[in-house]
């Protein structure tokens, strides 16, 4: 049992919560925090919103964002993507891992009318070592951040 | 464990085509993107271009964009490449790869 | 497309030296996400490439830390610290930045 314990303590595992900086504007993944609060990172590292992978093996990675908005965003495509996205070491390009679409504003009938959605994604990979994991929103205006409870990351090895 | 496996040597003659396959174990190969890369005997690598098994999307190198033509099954967990209209140049060692593992090669012979 | 060159083409080494590899490429390797995607790989005799530092330095999975990669840009260099039995074969430095990738001629370490 002690074996057992020990062991499991030293699984990869992180999670990271959403902070006033997560939104950046860019079309960059969200950003996150990594230490204050509930966030923490044990076995991952943490480089420009991406958790990165020490130890290769099988992580359940999830994430969930906290939609919001009053009425319909002008120039708001019909759907927001919110995905988990794979980097690897060769490519720039980015591979999708998990992705969900929202269509929040085709319930906003009013201009006026508060709403608010959420979206969770989880799921097991195989992950290697020196591979990124991101979190993509779009339409990033629409994700709301409150004390870190609401939109978060995270993953750990199973 | 992580497998690239790929098909036999193939001997085959001029003006003919032939299709390689590369056969993924060992992890889901939706989230790999699989490069094809040719070596001539004693000679160094020749990038031909990449394809997302998932989406289907590819790249290629423009030197080769008349000659090879990469595809994938998902449901095999398969990549292929087809190479048309072979010369004595096209023979080489053709492998597949991730971006961290290489397959074995596939030997090609052109020849009458 | 870039051409990437390698240097020396051929190494003649006695087991325990200290050895460097060095790559040039014609343009830039920086992409705009931040990143430089320039990497080494070994082959050894009859056998498929292997990668060995992917991102300029960082050792992948397995590879001992007598190798070492460093640069930036256009200029890169491998470094092995004592070379041992199991490091002959063929170096290669390769760019994924840009499209196509390309690879740099090789460099093989022999014992003299």
């Known amino acids: 049992l002690i074996q057992e314990r020990r062991s499991h303590e030293v699984n990869p595992a992180a999670h990271l919560t959403g902070a006033n900086s997560s939104l950046t504007g860019s079309g960059g993944p969200l950003l996150w925090e990594t230490q204050l609060g509930l966030a923490f990172l044990r076995g991952l590292s943490y480089h420009d919103g991406a958790l990165v992978v020490t130890k290769a093996g099988y992580y359940y990675i999830y994430s969930k964002v906290q939609l919001g908005g009053v009425g319909c965003p002008l120039g708001l495509a019909s759907t927001i993507t919110h995905g988990l996205y794979k980097r690897t070491p060769r490519y720039p390009e980015e591979l999708e891992l998990l992705v969900s679409q929202q269509s929040p504003c085709g319930r906003a009938t009013s201009s006026s009318r508060v709403w608010w959605d959420s979206s969770f994604l989880g799921g097991v990979v195989h992950l290697e070592a020196g591979e990124k994991v991101v979190v993509r929103v779009l339409d990033e205006r629409l994700v709301r951040l409150r004390d870190g409870t609401r939109s978060y990351f995270g993953a750990f090895m199973v | 464990q992580v497998q690239l496996q790929q098909s036999g040597a193939e001997l085959v003659r001029p003006g003919t085509s032939v299709q390689v396959s590369c056969k993924a174990s060992?992890?889901?190969?939706?989230?790999?993107?699989i490069e094809w890369i040719k070596q001539r005997p004693g000679q160094g690598l020749e990038w031909i271009g990449v394809?997302?098994?998932?989406?289907?999307?590819?790249k290629y190198n423009e030197n080769f964009r008349a000659k090879a033509i990469m595809t994938a099954d998902k449901y095999s967990s398969t990549a292929y490449m087809q190479l048309s209209s072979l010369t004595a140049d096209d023979s080489a060692v053709y492998f597949c790869?991730?971006?961290?593992?290489w397959g074995q090669g596939t030997t090609l012979t052109v020849s009458s | 497309d870039v051409v990437m060159t390698q240097a020396p083409l051929s190494l003649p080494v006695s087991l325990g030296d200290q050895v460097s590899i060095s790559c040039r490429s014609s343009?830039?390797?920086?992409?705009?996400?931040?990143?430089?995607?320039f990497h080494w790989y070994l082959q050894k005799p009859g056998q498929s490439p292997e990668l060995l530092i992917y991102?300029?330095?960082n050792r992948f999975s397995g590879v001992p830390d007598r190798f070492s990669g460093s640069g930036s840009g256009t200029d890169f260099t491998l470094k092995i610290s004592r070379v041992e039995a199991e490091d002959l074969g063929v170096y290669f430095c390769?760019?994924?930045?840009?499209?196509?990738?390309?690879f740099g001629g090789g460099t093989k370490l022999e014992i003299k």
């Open positions: 343009q830039n390797l920086v992409h705009s996400n931040g990143n430089t995607y």
């Open positions: 394809i997302n098994p998932g989406t289907g999307e590819t």
């Open positions: 390769s760019q994924s930045t840009h499209v196509p990738y390309t």
């Open positions: 060992g992890y889901s190969f939706t989230t790999y993107l």
């Open positions: 790869a991730r971006w961290d593992r």
């Open positions: 991102k300029v330095s």
